[in-house]
Structure formats: structure tokens, C-alpha cells
Interface confidence: medium
């Protein structure tokens, strides 16, 4: 903490301007009025203060607003935001998307810091749900944002917000997250026609159940292998050889290269070898020809 010292004669700041960069830390503390700083925060960002000087300015704001800064100040924090701790940010009440954008801009190009994560958490909780505009903003700054949320947090995403999601936003999502997002996407895109629907839903298919994959296989969608490999194993297992052939279309040949990988290897084990042979791909490891498989066991395998 900077010691309280009297402001030297003639140095009392009347404006937040560039002359302040020549002030020593103790002079800033003594000569800059906190209320003046708060009303002219928008000017701070344009002045090349040192990190040490920014520490003093933060300290002045902390003294003025011990319960947390008002949004009028938060919106203009600029690089001073980088000085904030998650504890500081938890005291804030940020409701404006413009404020959120302004602060995310400061951190642009960097990994999501604990400060940013706390800010986003405060903002989303304040809004009650992850609406489309917020999701648009967050994924623009952090493409992996959606996949950083827990399945519980994702459940608050309304289907209408799914329109803001781009394929790359889902790259790091795990199956549990896609399980939550897929039904929302299905609802969001339900009025689209076949080919347009598939283009939109494709990124979410890692959460699709068997019956939806069966339905897609009847629509000549020609799913690529990369998408197929991301499908839920338990959703792929009940598909017949014919259904997989229809689902993949010309991409079915790619199964050979993936025969050792999940979910293909699990699916192969559950198919009759003579059915696999009809694909002409040389896939091996299916149920031996002539081997009797009881329906009871197969039902359990699919349950």
C-alpha cells in the first residue's frame, strides 16, 4: 500500500491526462482524486502508464468502491482490467454486453485467464442464461468457450442460441457436452430441409442417439469419416452394415483405415462377417459365419 503523503504544491490533477505519466507513485496517490479518476476512466487507456502506476490507480478505485466498481467504471477499465483479481471481479455486477466486449477486447489473443473466466461467469449468471448475443460474443473471442462449460452449465443454453455456434466452437467438446447440445441443435434446426439440416447438425452429431442416425441413413447424407468417428459408440453399435453403408455413402471405403479405432472396431465386432464381406473392404473381426447369436444377448448389448 502506498503511504499517504500531501500533494506537492501545483501538482493537484484537474484532468486525467498525459502529464500524469511523469508522476511518481506517491504523487499519483496524493494528487489524483479517486472520484475524478472514476469519471475520466475512459482516458486512462490512452495514456502509457507503467504497471506500477496502474497499481496506484487501481488502489484509488478500490478505496472509492470497496463493495465493487459500478458498471460505468468497469466499462472503461481498459488495460487496468488486467490488474484485477478474480476476487475483485466477483464484487462486480456486469449487465451490459458492451461492457463485456470492452473487457474481452483487452485480453484478446490470449488464453482465457482466471479473471476473464470469472467475468464471464458473473455476466452469464446475471443474465440467467446463455443467450444468442452473449454466445456470439464469447465464441468470437474464445472459440473453445462452449466446450469449457460443464454439461450442467450447457443445459441453460436456449436452443435459439445454437444458431450462433460454429463447427470450430465444438472442436474440444467431449461426448457428455454434446449429449446436452445435440437435442438443442435438433430443436433449433428442425424446420430446415434435409441437406441444409445435415450441414448444420453435423457438428453436433457426437450427441446423437441411434434412432437419429438410422433416420439420417435414409436421407443420402454422405457423412464423412471424421464425423462418423466422433459419433457415440453406443449409438453406432446397433446400426446394421446396410445402414452404415447408406449413412457414409461413398465415404464407406474409409472404414478400412479406421477398423482398429473406436467406434468402428466396436461396431465390426457386432456385425456378421458375411455382412461385412458385402462391403468388399476386407474388414475382419466380425461374428464368425455360422455362429449362433442369441437375441437375448444382443438386446443386452444394445441396452
Amino acid at each position: 500500500e502506498v503511504e499517504k503523503t500531501a500533494c506537492p504544491s501545483g501538482k493537484k490533477a484537474r484532468e486525467i491526462d498525459e502529464s500524469l505519466i511523469f508522476y511518481k507513485k506517491w504523487e499519483l496517490e496524493a494528487c489524483v482524486d479517486a472520484a475524478l479518476l472514476a469519471t475520466q476512466m475512459d482516458r486512462v487507456n490512452a495514456i502509457p502508464f507503467t504497471y506500477e502506476q496502474l497499481d496506484v490507480l487501481k488502489h484509488k478505485l478500490d478505496e472509492l468502491y470497496p463493495q465493487g466498481y459500478p458498471e460505468s467504471v468497469i466499462q472503461h477499465l481498459g488495460y487496468l482490467f488486467l490488474k484485477m483479481s478474480p476476487e475483485d471481479i466477483r464484487k462486480w455486477n456486469v449487465t451490459s454486453l458492451e461492457t463485456l466486449k470492452a473487457l474481452l477486447e483487452v485480453n484478446k489473443g490470449h488464453e482465457m485467464s482466471p479473471q476473464v473466466a470469472t467475468l464471464i461467469d458473473r455476466f452469464v449468471k446475471g443474465r440467467g442464461q446463455l443467450d444468442k448475443d452473449t454466445l456470439d460474443t464469447l465464441t468470437a473471442f474464445y472459440p473453445g468457450y462452449l466446450c469449457s462449460l460443464s454439461p450442467e452449465e450447457l443445459s441453460s443454453v436456449p436452443p435459439s442460441s445454437i444458431w450462433a455456434v460454429r463447427p470450430q466452437d465444438l472442436d474440444t467438446c467431449d461426448p457428455r457436452q454434446l449429449d446436452v447440445l445435440y437435442p438443442k441443435a435438433r430443436l433449433a434446426f428442425q424446420n430446415m430441409n434435409g441437406s441444409e439440416y445435415f450441414v448444420k447438425i453435423q457438428s453436433f452429431l457426437g450427441g446423437a442417439p441411434t434412432e437419429d442416425l438410422k433416420a439420417l441413413s435414409q436421407q443420402n447424407v454422405s457423412m464423412d469419416l471424421a464425423t462418423f468417428m466422433k459419433l457415440r459408440t453406443d449409438a453406432v453399435l446397433p446400426l446394421t452394415v446396410a445402414e452404415v453403408q447408406k449413412l457414409l455413402g461413398p465415404h464407406v471405403e474409409g472404414l478400412k483405415a479406421e477398423e482398429r479405432h473406436r467406434p468402428v472396431r466396436d461396431w465390426i465386432l457386432r456385425q456378421r462377417q458375411d455382412d461385412l464381406d458385402t462391403l468388399g473392404l476386407g474388414l475382419q473381426g466380425g461374428i464368425p459365419n455360422g455362429y449362433l447369436v442369441l437375441d437375448l444377448s444382443m438386446q443386452e448389448a444394445l441396452s
Epitope: 453406443d234 473406436r262 472396431r265 473381426g285 461374428i287 464368425p288 447369436v293 443386452e300
Partner: antibody
């Protein structure tokens, strides 16, 4: 709860065939939810997966051992077996049978049986 | 074949320490990564499956994280019974492969 128990000779001569059986109790080898694997661990070394069998008879073997390995299942006895032919001293190891669930993890293991290849 | 590389191969720690073991796959394996604990003369015991899911009956002091190629097993506060060898294993692609193991010893 489900338990696995390996059985078979502890000493096998070089060039002969190693034969082990794993008996499943408290559950069924015919369950469609599991793969039944064999895994081995040479003394003081790490774990090596040998292969697995599905109740339907479908198998998947480690390519490094494929030419010498046969895994079979006997649903009537609730057992699955391992045969490893043309053994050498390098096959000396503790052999484990294990159950792999849908999540891809070996959640239940036998206690292991030491097999020494020596003349 | 997918190679699994564990580090460190051994470490010394004290009761109460936080311990982190890493496992790297030679190619992406999504979340198909499991962790096991093995004590001398015993079969391995499953701790974590699907990279981060705690196996039933395993103490909550064990946790797993990671996706793609890089994974971590963390023991938040080492207990006397946790001194053992730990293995990672990928189940994405056959042949199923294990890491070389990390031996956790008493300092």
C-alpha cells in the same frame, strides 16, 4: 460381484503352447456389454495387451502376437481361454484376464497367474 | 500402434503432497484414456476411465484431466496407501496400449 480367475500350468517348455483359462463368476461371459481380454506383464516390466474376445466369438489380437494367439469363449462353462503357441523365454510373465466395459476400461481383473517358459 | 509415454518414470513424495503424473499419446485418442494403480504382487486397479471419470469406490483425491494427446492424473493429497505404480492406457485404437508406468515412492 463379478470375479475372474485364471488357471493353467505355471511352467511351459520352449516351443510348446501356453494354455490358460479364465473363469467368470458372478456374471455372464455372454453379456453383450463387455469384451474379455488377456493382458500380460513380464517380471519387473509394464503391461501388454494380448487380445480380446466378444461373446459372439469375434476376436481382436495384438498384431505383435497375432500369428501365435488364439482366444476362444465357452459360454456354457462361462469361460474364455488363451492359447499362445511356440513360446520362448520372452513369454515368461504374469498373465491376467480382464473385463473391458463399454467405457473402454478394464474394470475387473483376475489376480494373475505366473507362467514361466523354461526347459 | 499408438505409443503412450508416461512421465516421470518414478517420483519420490511425502504423505500429504500433491502429485501429478502425465501421459502423452502419439496421436489423438479423444477421451479414451484410463488410469490404473498397481501394487507389488497385485493386479492393476482401475482409478479413472474416459480421461476424467472416477471409477466407483475410488477416493475423490484422485482426478484425471485431458483430451486429445495430453492427459494428467492428479492425487490431491498423497496417502500412505497411494504409494504404488500408476499406468495410463488408451482404448481408442487396437492394439490397446499402456504407458510405461510411474512408480510413486516414499521420500
Amino acid at each position: 460381484q463379478v470375479q475372474l480367475q485364471e488357471s493353467g500350468p505355471g511352467l511351459v517348455k520352449p516351443s510348446e503352447t501356453l494354455s490358460l483359462t479364465c473363469t467368470v463368476s458372478g456374471g455372464s461371459v455372454s453379456s453383450g456389454s463387455y469384451y474379455w481380454s488377456w493382458i500380460r506383464q513380464p517380471p519387473g516390466k509394464g503391461l501388454e495387451w494380448i487380445g480380446y474376445i466378444y461373446y459372439s466369438g469375434s476376436t481382436n489380437y495384438n498384431p505383435s502376437l497375432k500369428s501365435r494367439v488364439t482366444i476362444s469363449v465357452d459360454t456354457s462353462k462361462n469361460q474364455f481361454s488363451l492359447k499362445l503357441s511356440s513360446v520362448t523365454a520372452a513369454d515368461t510373465a504374469v498373465y491376467y484376464c480382464a473385463r473391458e466395459g463399454k467405457n473402454g476400461a478394464f474394470d475387473i481383473w483376475g489376480q494373475g497367474t505366473m507362467v514361466t517358459v523354461s526347459s | 500402434d499408438i505409443q503412450m509415454t508416461q512421465s516421470p518414470s518414478s517420483l519420490s513424495a511425502s504423505v500429504g503432497d500433491r502429485v501429478t503424473i502425465t501421459c502423452r499419446a502419439s496421436q489423438s485418442i479423444s477421451s479414451y484414456l484410463n488410469w490404473y494403480q498397481q501394487k507389488p504382487g497385485k493386479a492393476p486397479k482401475l482409478l479413472i476411465y474416459a480421461a476424467s471419470s472416477l471409477q466407483s469406490g475410488v477416493p475423490s483425491g484422485f482426478s484425471g484431466s485431458g483430451s486429445g494427446t495430453d492427459f494428467t492424473l492428479t492425487i490431491s493429497s498423497l496417502q500412505p496407501e497411494d504409494f504404488a505404480t500408476y499406468y495410463c492406457q488408451q482404448s481408442y485404437s487396437t492394439p490397446l496400449t499402456f504407458g510405461g508406468g510411474t512408480k510413486v515412492e516414499i521420500k
